[in-house]
């Protein structure tokens, strides 16, 4: 979002809007607030980063992350006889995930015709909305999945109601905090005429009015609280289970967990540096430059990175597979075209097979369905 | 070289408009917007309306209803028109180019019009 | 809408007299301010834009300074041809003007 020059001709936010006493020139309309941008922040909006990179890049999001969180979703619900504490927050994600990616096509199609909103100022809060509470429900969720993982390794006590309704409660009360600190998003105005571009921006320009300070302040908040917090949390945990996972005693089963928790490690990493650090990081600065110099130097790294941070949307459904068997199963069917109903058959008559000629060579542990928690 | 050249001097009647013109040579009117400024007499100078180069159009709260600027990319030539005219409304009228962003300023005026209204 | 303050509305100085001329704005704006000098009879003309750089073709001796709320303008040594109306306009949140500073001959 950049500083837009508000001039108001009634004290209202109203924008782009042709009244009924406003004079209508040749081929453009008589604005009643105006908002100017300086000429940098116009040629990324009209640039190809924003109309051509992108829609690219939320395509692919869009593409990749609909089915195979939706799938996750579904494996979790339906398909998990166990509702382990970590199937439940990975649900959670999967929900976040669709929530944010299902409002995509609208997001491809505003950046695809020059960055100009013709879907209403309701449709452009919910997607900004969605937007950012997906963002900071991942990396809540995230954390929780990855302080799940630690206690496991620390207490492999067996599943129990009470862990399951913990998991429950503290996802409820995720929402519900997400939902709070999302309700400026919800209110402040987000879609703003830009007479100079002739285009209705949805967040990408704000208007002065709209204290900058308080953006700042509003970012700043969400950085540290919801992000670098939990981001420490989440860090701790995973150096404390590289550190209980080279302790413990090397057997095959042992290994392939260890092998499983380190590409959890790497993913989780890779997600905080692709998608949830550059973001907030530039949030941070950005409106701190808004603040302090009335225009902002890094609105195009911005602009990448907020687009960057969808990616978490993608790289989500790795996290599934390292933790979860159940996904792990559906996945791998799913990528094959065959249905698990399929493949527990061919399991049967392999394990009738195996028992007749008591052998144990056929032994396959990635076609079970098992929860690891 | 950027040259704005405005219409001659008028004389009006109270109630009745004025329309002047602002003829734009060594850029394109379509590139750049155009601004209104005027000037009583031993005055300080007034922003009173702006016409962008896609012909959006945005008027002071103060001369919303009678002020109208319109342009003829045609003839590359940007018009004020200002209508209900008052004696307060004697001034030198000046168009201005403006880049049409916020860290641009009016880089070049016209010669300005004089406009009387006298009954 | 922002109010500009200019000050002082006359200045008397002689040529090669340095002049400082203040332009006070109600609410931040930023670096969004520029410089306008009017002699009687012409339009405006463009010296200094967005608070310190200078137009093309304006000499060196212009000069400006500020900030957010405060500005100069500075002629470091006046010529004969520099005494004029100077105006400031900020551009920040809607187009005005200030009252303007008459820089007269001592």
């Known amino acids: 979002t950049i500083q837009g020059t508000n001039r108001s001709s009634k004290g209202r936010s109203l924008i782009g809007k042709v009244d009924g006493t406003s004079h209508v020139t040749g081929k453009g309309v008589t604005v009643e607030t105006v908002f100017s941008v300086d000429e940098f922040s116009a040629s990324v909006l009209t640039g190809k980063l924003t109309t051509v990179f992108l829609p690219i890049v939320y395509t692919i999001v869009f593409v990749v992350g609909l089915p195979s969180n939706g799938m996750a979703l579904w494996v979790f619900l339906f398909r998990t006889k166990k509702k382990h504490p970590a199937v439940i927050y990975m649900a959670n994600l999967a929900l976040a995930d669709l929530l944010s990616v299902i409002w995509f096509p609208l997001k491809i199609a505003y950046h695809i015709h020059g960055n100009n909103w013709i879907y209403g100022e309701a449709l452009c809060n919910v997607l900004i909305g969605f937007f950012y509470g997906n963002m900071y429900c991942s990396i809540l969720f995230m954390t929780c999945l990855s302080v799940q993982r630690y206690w496991v390794i620390v207490n492999p006590m067996g599943h129990s109601r009470k862990k399951a309704n913990i998991a429950i409660g503290i996802s409820l009360a995720i929402w519900l905090l997400i939902l709070l600190v999302t309700i400026p998003l919800y209110v402040v105005k987000q879609t703003i005429f830009i007479p100079a571009l002739n285009i209705t921006t949805c967040h990408d320009v704000l208007p002065e009015q709209l204290l900058v300070g308080d953006m700042f302040n509003y970012f700043l908040s969400l950085a540290i609280g919801v992000f670098l917090f939990p981001a420490f949390l989440t860090a701790s945990a995973y150096v404390l289970m590289i550190r209980m996972l080279r302790s413990s005693a090397m057997d095959e089963n042992s290994e392939k967990k260890r092998k499983r928790a380190i590409k959890l490690i790497v993913t989780v990493l890779a997600m905080y540096l692709i998608c949830f650090t550059p973001s907030n990081l530039l949030l941070v600065v950005h409106y701190f430059l808004i603040k302090s110099q009335g225009q902002s130097h890094v609105y195009a790294l911005y602009i990448v990175a907020l687009c960057l941070s969808t990616l978490n949307s993608c790289i989500d459904p790795f996290v599934y597979y390292f933790v979860s068997h159940d996904f792990r199963d559906h996945a791998k069917n799913a990528l094959l075209c065959r249905s698990v109903r399929t493949v527990k058959q061919m399991q049967v008559s392999l394990t009738s097979k195996k028992h007749s000629r008591k052998s144990s060579s056929y032994s396959s542990s990635s076609t079970t369905v098992k929860t690891s928690y | 070289q950027v040259q704005l050249v405005q219409s001659g001097a008028e004389v009006k009647k109270p109630g009745s408009s004025v329309k002047v013109s602002c003829k734009a040579s060594?850029?394109?009117?379509?590139?750049?917007?155009i601004s209104w400024v005027r000037q009583a007499p031993g005055q300080g100078l007034e922003w009173m309306g702006v016409?962008?180069?896609?012909?959006?159009?945005y008027y002071a709260q103060k001369f919303q209803g009678r002020v109208t600027i319109t342009a003829d990319e045609s003839t590359s030539t940007a018009y004020m028109e200002l209508s209900s005219l008052r004696s307060e409304d004697t001034a030198v009228y000046y168009c201005?180019?403006?880049?049409?962003?916020?860290?641009?300023?009016?880089?070049?005026w016209g010669q300005g019009t004089l406009v009387t209204v006298s009954s | 809408e922002i109010v500009l303050t200019q000050s002082p509305a006359t200045l008397s100085l002689s040529p090669g007299e340095r002049a400082t001329l203040s332009c006070r704005a109600s609410?931040?704006?930023?670096?969004?301010l520029d410089w306008y000098q009017q002699k009687p009879g012409q339009a405006p003309r463009l010296l200094i834009y967005n608070a310190y750089s200078r137009a093309t073709g304006i000499p060196a001796r212009f000069s400006g300074s500020g900030s957010g709320r405060d500005f100069t303008l500075t002629i470091s040594s006046l010529e004969p041809e520099d005494f004029a109306v100077y105006y400031c306009q900020q551009h920040n949140s809607g187009w005005t003007f200030g009252g303007g500073t008459k820089v007269e001959i001592k």
């Open positions: 060594g850029f394109s009117l379509s590139s750049y917007a």
């Open positions: 016409i962008w180069g896609n012909g959006n159009t």
């Open positions: 609410q931040n704006v930023y670096k969004w």
């Open positions: 201005a180019r403006w880049r049409g962003y916020k860290d641009y300023p009016f880089d070049y």
